[in-house]
């Protein structure tokens, strides 16, 4: 027989030879990191037909790391389903808890013993320090010193000393989240007031108000014979300016050779279409179709 078979978990006892006589026996032992559990044979014999009798390494089992219990308020998950060396043990914490230590342990061989690569981690309760205090405002539970996971506070603005109220800019409700941090930055309380939006040759059609505070929304339309240059809808933003800017109403061109500018993509269509004679491929009529429009 030629050289005997090799195995992942078993190795030959003694030095291998290039050739073996019929009836000659070779013995195996489990490799380092494996241990033997009977009854499977760990030897083979060179048979009369010059082949080795069947043998397998299935009696050699990997060394195992000790079982680790789930951490309190968490879970230990075996990545490949067994505790044999080479295994990975992943740790996760329940919602509201965070991990202290390594989130993965590896089952490793030290000499002939399988041991874990470190100490199992702990799951600690997520706690937050009080959220920031804000100028011209306050938050609920201001007397609480420690907040637990998902505990929420709501901010509100104080009454303003002047005629215009404080607006709350940002998230009014924030909660204690992962990493013991608050879900959002604290909001801001300040007076936000936009100027009265004046549009020549047009007018406001919605969002009427005494004054225009934070997030006030106004819509416009142009007079007949004028088209909107800009957006028909504007919003009062936190820096007390309109966004997009207040639009303009421009006169629709009556010249058959000059093309009227079009309104922005976000805005509405012109309130009166420019004459078709402005476009290539159309014949130019003798009389401009807009000549009799009221101003």
């Amino acid at each position: 027989c030629e050289a005997p078979p090799t195995f992942e978990a078993m190795e030959l006892i003694g030095k291998p030879k290039p050739y073996y006589r019929v009836g000659e026996r070779v013995d195996y032992k489990c490799k380092k990191g494996y241990f033997y559990i009977p009854p499977l044979a760990t030897h083979t014999i060179c048979d009369r037909n010059h082949t080795w009798l069947p043998v397998s390494d299935e009696g050699c089992y990997r060394e195992m790391c000790p079982h680790i219990r789930d951490p309190l308020n968490g879970e230990a998950i075996l990545a490949n389903g067994s505790y044999e060396f080479g295994a990975e043990l992943h740790f996760i914490c329940n919602e509201g808890y965070y991990l202290i230590g390594k989130d993965i342990l590896y089952c490793e061989l030290k000499d002939t013993v399988a041991i874990w690569s470190g100490k199992p981690p702990l799951c600690e309760k997520i706690l937050c320090t009080p959220p920031p205090k804000i100028k011209n405002g306050k938050h609920t539970f201001s007397e609480v010193e420690v907040f637990e996971y998902l505990d929420a506070v709501t901010y509100s603005c104080d009454p303003a000393p002047g005629p215009d109220p404080f607006s709350l800019i940002g998230e009014s409700m924030i909660y204690c989240g992962n990493n013991s941090t608050w879900s959002h930055a604290a909001p801001e309380c300040k007076v936000v007031k936009c100027r009265f939006p004046v549009v020549e040759n047009g007018k406001q059609i919605s969002g009427f108000g005494k004054k225009f505070y934070y997030k006030a929304t106004v819509m416009f339309e142009c007079d007949k014979g004028y088209y909107l240059n800009g957006s028909d809808k504007i919003v009062c933003e936190s820096n007390s300016t309109w966004d997009p800017p207040v639009p303009k109403c421009l006169k629709v061109s009556t010249s058959p050779t000059t093309k009227s500018p079009t309104s922005s993509a976000s805005g509405p269509r012109p309130t009166y279409k420019p004459p078709v004679s402005n476009y290539p491929g159309y014949p130019k009529p003798d009389e401009g179709i807009l000549n009799n429009l009221d101003d």
Epitope: K193, R195, N201, Q204, F208, K210
Partner: antibody, heavy 118, light 107 residues
Framework: EVQLVESGGGLVQPGGSLRLSCAAS????????ISWIRQSPSRGLEWLGV???????NYNSAFMSRFTISRDDSKNTAYLQMNSLKTEDTAVYYC????????????WGQGTLVTVSS | AIQLTQSPSSLSASVGDRVTITCRAS??????LNWYLQKPGQSPQLLIY???SLFSGVPDRFSGSGSGTDFTLKISRVEAEDVGVYYC?????????FGQGTKVEIK
């Protein structure tokens, strides 16, 4: 509190020109939106136009071709330039501080009289 | 331009009377209407803005109401110092325009 004082009124012949001034004291003219309004017995109160803090202007289209509003920040003064004056332009002319960016006329000057007559 | 028509053009009231002045717009102006009083020999002064909001320092015997095209200024108990000409003004659309005025006298 800013005070606005109009000046430059007087007698002018038809077809003539006149420049009215609106001087601000106790504040900067560039910090306020300034409107010009006139009043006559025959035509009542008429809004002429406004110059905004950013220097932009809006006019009453009835006067746009003849009247121009401007501002000189170094002199802390707003102006109303009136050309091609007609007899019907005879009126008391007021400059007025628009209330906080809103078209509410809360702070009127004492007015200056313009008489257009031959 | 939007026209504002005031009525009556003049009225005479006794001290303590309730006075009502109306202002009608030629088209809808939402609540974008102000009221002014011009006392004899003085410049106009703002009384009410945005239909019903009292300007600072204005006595609460003055009140405004209305919406759209029809607006009212009421003086609950007129006083001698309330004499003068009352004007309405719209600001929904340029040019901003005034009513022709209502003259209030005390009997």
């Amino acid at each position: 509190e800013v005070q606005l004082v109009e000046s430059g009124g007087g007698l002018v012949q038809p077809g003539g020109s006149l420049r009215l001034s609106c001087a601000a004291s106790g504040g900067s003219v560039s910090s306020y939106d300034i409107s010009w309004i006139r009043q006559s017995p025959s035509r009542g109160l008429e809004w002429l136009g406004v110059i905004w803090t950013d220097g932009g202007t809006n006019y009453n289209s009835a006067f746009m071709s003849r009247f121009t509003i401007s501002r000189d920040d170094s002199k802390n003064t707003a102006y109303l330039q009136m050309n091609s004056l007609k007899t019907e332009d005879t009126a008391v002319y007021y400059c007025e501080r628009v209330y906080d960016g809103y078209p509410w006329f809360a702070y009127w000057g004492q007015g200056t009289l313009v008489t257009v007559s031959s | 331009a939007i026209q504002l028509t005031q009525s009556p053009s003049s009225l005479s009231a006794s001290v303590g009377d309730r006075v009502t002045i109306t202002c009608r717009a030629s088209q809808g102006i939402s609540n974008y209407l102000n009221w002014y009083l011009q006392k004899p020999g003085q410049s106009p002064q703002l009384l009410i803005y945005y239909t019903s909001s009292l300007f600072s320092g204005v006595p609460d015997r003055f009140s405004g109401s209305g919406s759209g095209t029809d607006f009212t200024l009421k003086i609950s108990r007129v006083e001698a110092e309330d004499v003068g000409v009352y004007y309405c003004q719209q600001y929904i659309k340029l040019p901003w325009t005034f009513g022709q005025g209502t003259k209030v006298e005390i009997k």
